[in-house]
């Protein structure tokens, strides 16, 4: 069962974390090699992966979505699962990998010409149904921006980065823009290959913080062009 996976010694007996206390994200420590991890239609083995319990898609990384790992859908714990690649089956946008979205139950490329109209249409359709909302956070942000006591804090609706507090930038979050944290060293960043391509992003990331630039991670140099991972690194 899922809980036995979550509670196995392989999951629990990790090396002590490298960071993460005092309100800062820590550095990822990988463990539990060979866990079965659903990606696309088949179960595949992903080395060095620790199942991450979640309640919503937004808690997962950019390459993941939140769901039950069992086909029937365990009503209990959900975990972050690998995003679905193009032409794989989907039920909502968050299931599809970056650069794709869910159309008629299939992940399709976010083609610039058709993307915007279709995604807004889908958002309108699913807005009233709590189970199919695309993103709980931005939906809540759009509806209840009055809940924010301090203007420009993380999660606040914004128009430009100057609307956000120090250490935050204004970035797209589905159909709205909210204040998000400026990226720290080691965090995944987006390197735009061509001008204007950031227009396709549903979850736009902030830029790298001071003294950092967005560069290909050393161990990803051999990877194919499309899967190269960029991280914020010291100049």
């Amino acid at each position: 069962t899922l809980n036995s996976v979550l509670n196995s010694n392989a999951i629990k007996n990790l090396p002590p974390p490298l960071g993460g206390a005092a309100g800062h994200p820590g550095s990822a420590v990988s463990a539990a090699p060979g866990i079965l991890y659903p990606g696309g239609n088949k179960y595949q083995t992903i080395d060095n992966y620790q199942p991450y319990p979640c309640a919503e898609d937004e808690e997962c990384g950019t390459d993941e979505y939140c769901a039950s790992p069992t086909r029937g859908g365990d009503a209990g714990v959900q975990i972050c699962l690998a995003c679905r690649k193009r032409r794989k089956r989907c039920m909502r946008h968050a299931m599809c990998c970056p650069g794709n979205y869910c159309k008629n139950g299939i992940c399709v490329s976010s083609d610039q010409n058709h993307f915007r109209g279709e995604i807004e249409e889908t958002i309108t359709e699913s807005f009233g149904n709590d189970h199919s909302t695309l993103d709980g956070y931005s939906r809540r942000t759009t509806l209840s921006s009055k809940m924010y006591h301090t203007k420009g804090q993380e999660g606040s609706v914004c128009l430009r980065s100057s609307d956000c507090a120090s250490g935050l930038c204004c970035a797209r979050h589905f159909w709205s823009k909210i204040c998000k944290p400026v990226l720290k060293e080691g965090q995944v960043c987006t390197k735009h290959r061509r001008k204007g391509s950031h227009g396709l992003e549903i979850f736009q990331r902030c830029y790298c913080g001071e003294g950092l630039s967005c560069r290909i991670q050393k161990d990803h140099h051999q990877a194919s062009n499309s899967s190269r991972l960029h991280t914020c690194q010291r100049h």
Epitope: G23, C54, E56, C80
Partner: nanobody
Framework: EVQLVESGGGLVQPGGSLRLSCAAS????????MKWVRQAPGKGLEWVSH????????MYADSVKGRFTISRDNAMNMLYLQMNSLKPEDTAVYFC?????????????????RGQGTQVTVSS
Amino acid sequence: EVQLVESGGGLVQPGGSLRLSCAASGFPFSIYPMKWVRQAPGKGLEWVSHITRDGGRTMYADSVKGRFTISRDNAMNMLYLQMNSLKPEDTAVYFCARSAGKVVSRASLENDYRGQGTQVTVSS
């Protein structure tokens, strides 16, 4: 800046109870699911419990199910963990945590925002 401050830990006998609290600030608390994780001496982080934004749904690790209850007060920006029927194996530092979310490609407990933790010791 995201700030999470845990309190309520202490020394308790097996079978006893404790209520942990977590005061959150620096972010819009009510739009984030929250969780409790723990770290036993010499071990890695272990997920304990989760609660949705509105508190409508909760999830628990098998090891604490039926004994622990997670809750939240969005008006006060507070997260709670009621711990009953405590066992020696519950001894750990307990952290209140929030996902780092879409700033990483893959989520992990180590990447979460979390506080300094509160020590819970269950011993006779």
